[in-house]
Interface confidence: medium
């Protein structure tokens, strides 16, 4: 899960595999102030999971979420 510092969530590690796409309802990018670039996926149960924006599956999920 992202770590919040002064209300700015940052990620220090990425999830190791894709969650099923159906479990993800939304996403956001962490701030440019964070040391690691990251996408935060929010699951249907409101769990926040840090993901590596360079991974192909992450980009595909973002495209899918944008279209839905």
């Amino acid at each position: 899960s992202p770590y919040s510092s002064d209300t700015t969530p940052c990620c220090f590690a990425y999830i190791a595999r894709p969650l099923p796409r159906a479990h993800i309802k939304e996403y956001f990018y962490t701030s440019g102030k964070c040391s690691n670039p990251a996408v935060v996926f929010v699951t249907r149960k409101n769990r926040q999971v840090c993901a590596n924006p360079e991974k192909k599956w992450v980009r595909e999920y973002i495209n899918s979420l944008e279209m839905s």
């Epitope: 190791a16 595999r17 599956w57 595909e60």
Partner: antibody, heavy 123, light 111 residues
Framework: QVQLVQSGAEVEKPGASVKVSCRVS????????IHWVRQAPGKGLEWMGS????????IYAQRFQGRVTMTEETSANTAYMELSSLRSEDTAVYFC????????????????WGRGTLVTVSS | NFMLTQPHSVSESPGKTVTISCTGS????????VQWYRQRPGSAPSTVIY?????PSGVPDRISGSIDSSSNSASLTISGLTTEDEADYYC??????????FGGGTKLTVL
């Protein structure tokens, strides 16, 4: 340290069902997916499906759809795999394996496997 | 459907180096992490490489993993071979819905 303890060997007749259990210690079931993998004698590893914590529901490999049911009893931290309409080709060792579903990359993420349960289907 | 293909068997002499390939088809192998398992007869698989190139504690550094995006393949390399390395080796990854995918396995014989 996560550990998995599977139920003992089973011998079943064709057409019957078998239910294999997998008790998890050292990690809550609500945080991990439990995958089921089988290995027929002299063959490779075959993924059957998994029970996902997000929805508390299973996803199955297409070839087992309709014949396999994966469930969990969270109070007992135990996962189950039931395979029905058994045939001789289902004779195999059935493994459960953990998948720390939400975990970040790093050594805490690695899968842990049970020792396997031999299921023999014979008339 | 994403698939992983391995050679059925490889053999090499003690002390030498062997590389086992795992080629992806129907998708990019670099989309997700690759694991490698060693399985000795009568035992459950055990992890020798996780997350493409990471070694669990207890696995010697003569065992290494790598990914080559240009050939869409992963490789497991074992140097300084001993008879202890004789086993079946499986590569493993995921498709886009967290379904596990295994290679067919490679039998390593140390001559």
């Amino acid at each position: 340290q996560v550990q998995l303890v599977q139920s003992g060997a089973e011998v079943e007749k064709p057409g019957a069902s078998v239910k294999v259990s997998c008790r998890v210690s050292g990690y809550p079931l609500t945080e991990i997916a439990i995958h089921w993998v089988r290995q027929a004698p002299g063959k490779g590893l075959e993924w059957m499906g998994s029970f996902e914590p997000e929805d508390a529901e299973a996803i199955y490999a297409q070839r087992f759809q309709g014949r396999v049911t994966m469930t969990e009893e969270t109070s007992a931290n135990t996962a189950y795999m039931e395979l029905s309409s058994l045939r001789s080709e289902d004779t195999a060792v059935y493994f459960c394996a953990t998948d720390p579903y939400y975990a970040s990359s790093g050594s805490n993420y690695m899968e842990v496997w049970g020792r396997g349960t031999l299921v023999t289907v014979s008339s | 459907n994403f698939m992983l293909t391995q050679p059925h068997s490889v053999s090499e002499s003690p002390g030498k180096t062997v590389t086992i390939s795992c080629t992806g088809s129907g998708g990019s192998i670099s989309s997700n992490y690759v694991q490698w398992y060693r399985q000795r007869p009568g035992s459950a698989p055990s992890t020798v490489i996780y997350e493409d190139d990471q070694r669990p504690s207890g696995v010697p550094d003569r065992i290494s993993g790598s990914i080559d995006s240009s050939s869409n393949s992963a490789s497991l390399t074992i140097s300084g071979l001993t008879t202890e390395d004789e086993a079946d080796y499986y590569c493993h990854s995921y498709d886009g819905n967290n379904r596990w995918v295994f290679g067919g396995g490679t039998k390593l014989t140390v001559l």
